[in-house]
């Protein structure tokens, strides 16, 4: 990680992708520590952009503007050398977001995938972006970059992610950029949560008073397991959104969540999954599907008194 003997390592915290108006800490790690250092921005010339200022440990840059986007290097203090400074560090690209309209991000075949599968994340826009960038929340590495393919007034790029394992689960966003300002990125796409299933044992799903109910009768679906899941996720076939509830320890040592569906008006096939707070985007195997049938006079939909989660937010903790 530290590079060569006389080469410092420049890194950015929390990320190299910074929103306009945000702040980023640049750290120059040299010779097993954070010494005094100088920063350079590579604007065609290797001149200190910060007027020869010397920094200690880290430099907090911001509020950032589009002009801050670009490639940075540092030199560590080396008092007994000829120049007094080390060789230049690795290049570090800082990308500033919020400069163009946001693109859209889709998952094919979908955002809920089994461990080992591959997912295509397609970033697209009717803004003619030259490059698309894909970034996973909480990751400090550079985003993946692809050239946009333009057809019928739409620019798009397909990012292949896989084979999926827990480390790849999480919240993804994509950005676009135009040629003359490759590191001045667009506003972020709406977040897309990629969830990996099949990592833990399946919970069981049951219905109270039972899987066959009269129209208008209140129905509750209970998801439970001996595994100490923190959260249960309930999905209905054909519905984009899942509901989630905190698991509650029961006297019989199971962990359970009860999803009240309200007065039954419409049947459907339900599944539930368990997950742990530490890895909110890594889910258990699916429960066996539970078919809920409504006898009587079914209407077109089932009201949901519990607010379903949005298409994103799955990978955030429940507070």
């Amino acid at each position: 990680l530290m590079g060569g003997q006389d080469k410092p390592f420049l890194s950015a915290r929390p990320s190299t992708v910074v929103p306009r108006g945000g702040h980023v800490a640049l750290q120059c790690h040299y010779r097993r520590g954070f010494n005094n250092f100088m920063l350079y921005k590579e604007d065609r010339s290797h001149v200190p952009i910060f007027h020869g200022r010397i920094f200690q440990e880290s430099f907090i840059m911001g509020p950032v503007t589009p002009a801050h986007a670009g490639t940075y290097r540092c030199r560590g203090s080396r008092p007994h050398s000829l120049t007094g400074w080390s060789a230049p560090s690795n290049p570090l690209v800082i990308m500033v977001t919020g400069n163009h309209r946001k693109p859209s991000l889709l998952a094919h075949p979908g955002p809920l995938l089994k461990s080992g599968e591959t997912v295509i994340l397609q970033c697209w826009s009717d803004v003619m972006f030259e490059h698309f960038f894909l970034h996973r929340e909480g990751i400090s590495e550079d985003p993946s970059r692809l050239v946009g393919q333009i057809h019928d007034g739409v620019s798009k790029a397909n990012f292949s992610i896989g084979p999926l394992m827990p480390v790849l689960a999480g919240t993804y966003r994509c950005y676009g950029s135009v040629p003359h300002s490759p590191y001045q990125l667009s506003a972020p796409s709406d977040p897309l949560d990629i969830v990996i299933t099949g990592l833990y044992e399946k919970p069981s799903l049951s219905a109270q008073p039972g899987p066959t109910v009269q129209a208008g009768e209140n129905v509750t679906l209970s998801c439970s397991s001996w595994s100490s899941y923190d959260i249960y996720h309930l999905s209905r076939e054909g519905e984009a959104h899942e509901r989630r509830l905190r698991a509650v320890p029961k006297v019989n040592r199971t962990f359970q969540a009860d999803f009240p569906l309200g007065p039954a008006t419409h049947g459907g096939t339900y599944r539930c999954f368990g997950s742990f707070r530490a890895l909110p985007c890594v889910w258990s195997n699916s429960s066996d599907p539970l078919l809920v049938s409504v006898t009587g006079n079914p209407s077109s939909s089932w009201p949901s008194p519990t607010e379903p989660s949005s298409k994103s937010g799955i990978c955030r903790h429940l507070h």
Partner: antibody
């Protein structure tokens, strides 16, 4: 398409403001470029304005007396030239997108 | 600034002839090059972007090629309506810069 305002005849020292009205696409999708063409001469890029953020960028020769602005609600970009000089006599074009995909018909400004 | 050197500055060609115009950049422009055609008293018309991509509606006799610093526009079979002035533009780096233009006339 991009439709520009009509020709202007001005005296030296005056100000001119040219408009460029966009239609048929989402205005904030594409930056708006401005290009100067003096009579019998080639094309010269003046700069661009980011229609999403409103930030203008000027080429060195067009810093100072030149100003790009937007009226996003009307899908219109403007070029204003202050303190006009004889050498500003030219046709001014607006063109949108990173590779100047579509152009306005041009506005002839005569300073005399 | 990146300098775009276009050649020839003017040329005569016959109908049906194959015509090539070249543009040389003072540094690598990563294929971020457009070609335009301008007729007298009209605004420029975009023919090609990203060095090789034909804009919708532009006749297929036009083609672009090149990479790095050297680029060319070819008209495979010259048509009467192709006369005009042709410009290249680099959009890799600000400020954008145009070539000086090539005046194409029919002989």
């Amino acid at each position: 398409q991009l439709v520009q305002s009509g020709p202007e005849l001005k005296n030296p020292g005056e100000t001119v403001k040219i408009s460029c009205k966009a239609s048929g696409y989402t205005f904030t999708n594409y930056g708006m470029n401005w290009v100067k063409q003096a009579p019998g001469k080639g094309l010269k890029w003046m700069g661009w304005i980011n229609t999403y953020t409103g930030e203008p960028t000027y080429a060195d020769d067009f810093k100072g007396r030149f100003a790009f602005s937007l009226e996003t609600s009307a899908s219109t970009a403007y070029l204003q030239i202050n303190n006009l000089k004889n050498e500003d006599t030219a046709t001014y074009f607006c063109a949108h997108g990173p590779w100047l995909a579509y152009w306005g018909q041009g506005t002839l400004v005569t300073v005399s | 600034d990146i300098k775009m050197t276009q050649s020839p500055s003017s040329m005569y060609a016959s109908l049906g002839e194959r015509v090539t115009i070249t543009c040389k950049a003072s540094q690598d422009i990563n294929v971020y090059l457009s070609w335009f055609q301008q007729k007298p008293g009209k605004s420029p018309k975009t023919l090609i972007y990203r060095a090789i991509r034909l804009v919708d509606g532009v006749p297929s006799r036009f083609s672009g090629s090149g990479s790095g610093q050297d680029y060319s526009l070819t008209i495979s079979s010259l048509d009467y309506e192709d006369m005009g002035i042709y410009y290249c533009l680099q959009y890799d780096e600000l400020p954008y810069t145009f070539g000086g233009g090539t005046k194409l006339e029919i002989e």
